[in-house]
């Protein structure tokens, strides 16, 4: 196997590799730097393996995976030292590297010349005490949101930032505005920003207006 790649968004984490097997199968193992190897996706002909269940146990750990190649019908060794051939993945630290999924604007509410915009706190697959944690639960203040907003009638964008999932912005009375948000982890060196959320505009379903 080669080109071992971690594909991870909001902690949903899949290891992918090449090539498509012809006359052999794969088994994947994963471990933390100091832990024991755990086997997953036994003798699969797929070229991917979902490792989410393992990495969500501790998203701040650094993980390493390896993919073993076995000739079809022979699960014994193929290497010169009596070991099956395997390839190591790059190291992967979910907390620092998982991609931030596209956020969603949950709602916006106008009261006079202020608009309260709320970002949906997406549920992750990280569990604590038998409950799934939200993105905010996991990242805490490491996660901020940036709001882009503009008058429907113009293209000039303004921005606001928040350490929570809410914004409260000033708007001109009688004007309609459009909004988009982006999740950001400023302390990261890679995968710092999500893609922008879908644009939501005043006058659509998600909004409320009160004098």
């Amino acid at each position: 196997a080669f080109n071992l790649t971690w594909i991870s968004t909001d902690f949903k984490t899949i290891l992918e590799w090449q090539p498509k097997p012809t006359n052999y199968t794969y088994t994947v193992q994963i471990s933390t730097k100091s832990g024991d190897w755990k086997s997953k996706c036994f003798y699969t002909t797929d070229t991917e393996c979902d490792l989410t269940d393992e990495i969500v146990k501790d998203v701040k750990q650094t993980y390493l995976a390896r993919v073993f190649s076995y000739p079809a019908g022979n699960v014994e060794s193929t290497g010169s030292a009596g070991e099956p051939l395997y390839e190591n993945s790059p190291e992967f630290t979910p907390y620092l590297e998982t991609n931030l999924g596209q956020p969603t604007i949950q709602s916006f509410e106008q009261v006079g010349t202020k608009v309260n915009v709320t970002v949906e706190d997406e549920r992750t697959l990280v569990r604590r005490n038998n409950t799934f944690l939200s993105l905010r639960d996991v990242f805490g203040k490491d996660l901020i949101y940036t709001l882009y907003y503009w008058k429907s009638s113009s293209s000039g964008k303004k921005t606001a930032k928040t350490n929570t999932n809410e914004f409260l912005i000033d708007v001109d009375k009688g004007e309609n505005y459009c909004f988009s948000v982006q999740a950001v982890i400023p302390s990261r060196t890679v995968n710092r920003k999500s893609t922008d959320s879908p644009v939501e505009c005043m006058g659509q379903e998600k909004g409320e207006f009160r004098e």
């Epitope: 905010r136 639960d137 996991v138 990242f139 203040k141 930032k161 350490n163 914004f167």
Partner: antibody, heavy 125, light 108 residues
Framework: QVQLQESGPGLVKPSQTLSLTCTVS?????????WSWIRQHPGKGLEWIGE???????RYNPSLKSRVTISVDTSKNQFSLKLSSVTAADTAVYYC??????????????????WGKGTTVTVSS | EIVLTQSPGTLSLSPGERATLSCRAS???????LAWYQQKPGQAPRLLIY???TRQTGIPDRFSGSGSGTDFTLTISRLEPEDFAVYYC?????????FGGGTKVEIK
């Protein structure tokens, strides 16, 4: 009105673990705030130790990270500090504080707005 | 780590005078994360100013904050007897959160 109260031994022996608890009254520890520990060495300035969210998400001061554990017990409305392998340099007044969101510039940011009275911890044999 | 340097270390003034306290950061600090605290002997710090310039509820308007980037200022327009204390600036935008060394405002 939220109040915080630190508790724990005032004297700890060198190389042992310092353990303090902060009890939150007048509000829920699960209500969207963060909970911090700060210390102040005798006659000196303030040093941030770390913080925790009700979910267990933590941030620590890198200079203390290898020795610090902050945990939360939502059922008791408490959060705790453990500092291992203490030396005389860890002698200080230890404060717990609430980090609450305040509106600023279109968004919300966290500031330490409620503090406990502080508890003096001396490290000595 | 962002180092906050406060000056002067001690400010000796009389009641009714104006106090100007400086806080300089070793690198740029987002104003959203800059706060000022007051501490009196034997007491915990008290939040005065957040977002560099917004007064906390209940703080008299003689206290004002200003500045951006690396230079921030706390001004007490007319010192009252209860204002004599130590003042700390703090940044909470970058871990580790850091405090300045403090400025002691004492009675002249």
């Amino acid at each position: 009105q939220v109040q915080l109260q630190e508790s724990g031994p005032g004297l700890v022996k060198p190389s042992q673990t310092l353990s303090l608890t902060c009890t939150v009254s007048g509000g829920s520890i699960s209500s969207g705030q963060y909970w911090s520990w700060i210390r102040q060495h005798p006659g000196k300035g303030l040093e941030w130790i770390g913080e925790i969210y009700y979910s267990g998400s933590t941030r620590y001061n890198p200079s203390l990270k290898s020795r610090v554990t902050i945990s939360v017990d939502t059922s008791k409305n408490q959060f705790s500090l453990k500092l291992s392998s203490v030396t005389a340099a860890d002698t200080a007044v230890y404060y717990c504080a609430r980090d609450a969101p305040y509106y600023y510039g279109g968004g919300y940011y966290y500031y330490m707005d409620v503090w406990g009275k502080g508890t003096t911890v001396t490290v000595s044999s | 780590e962002i180092v906050l340097t406060q000056s002067p270390g001690t400010l000796s003034l009389s009641p009714g005078e104006r106090a100007t306290l400086s806080c300089r950061a070793s690198e740029s600090v987002d104003s959203s994360y800059l706060a000022w605290y007051q501490q009196k002997p034997g007491q915990a710090p008290r939040l005065l100013i957040y977002g560099a310039s917004t007064r906390q509820t209940g703080i008299p308007d003689r206290f004002s904050g200003s500045g951006s980037g690396t230079d921030f200022t706390l001004t007490i327009s007319r010192l009252e007897p209860e204002d004599f204390a130590v003042y700390y600036c703090q940044q909470a935008g970058v871990v580790p959160y850091t405090f300045g060394g403090g400025t002691k405002v004492e009675i002249k």
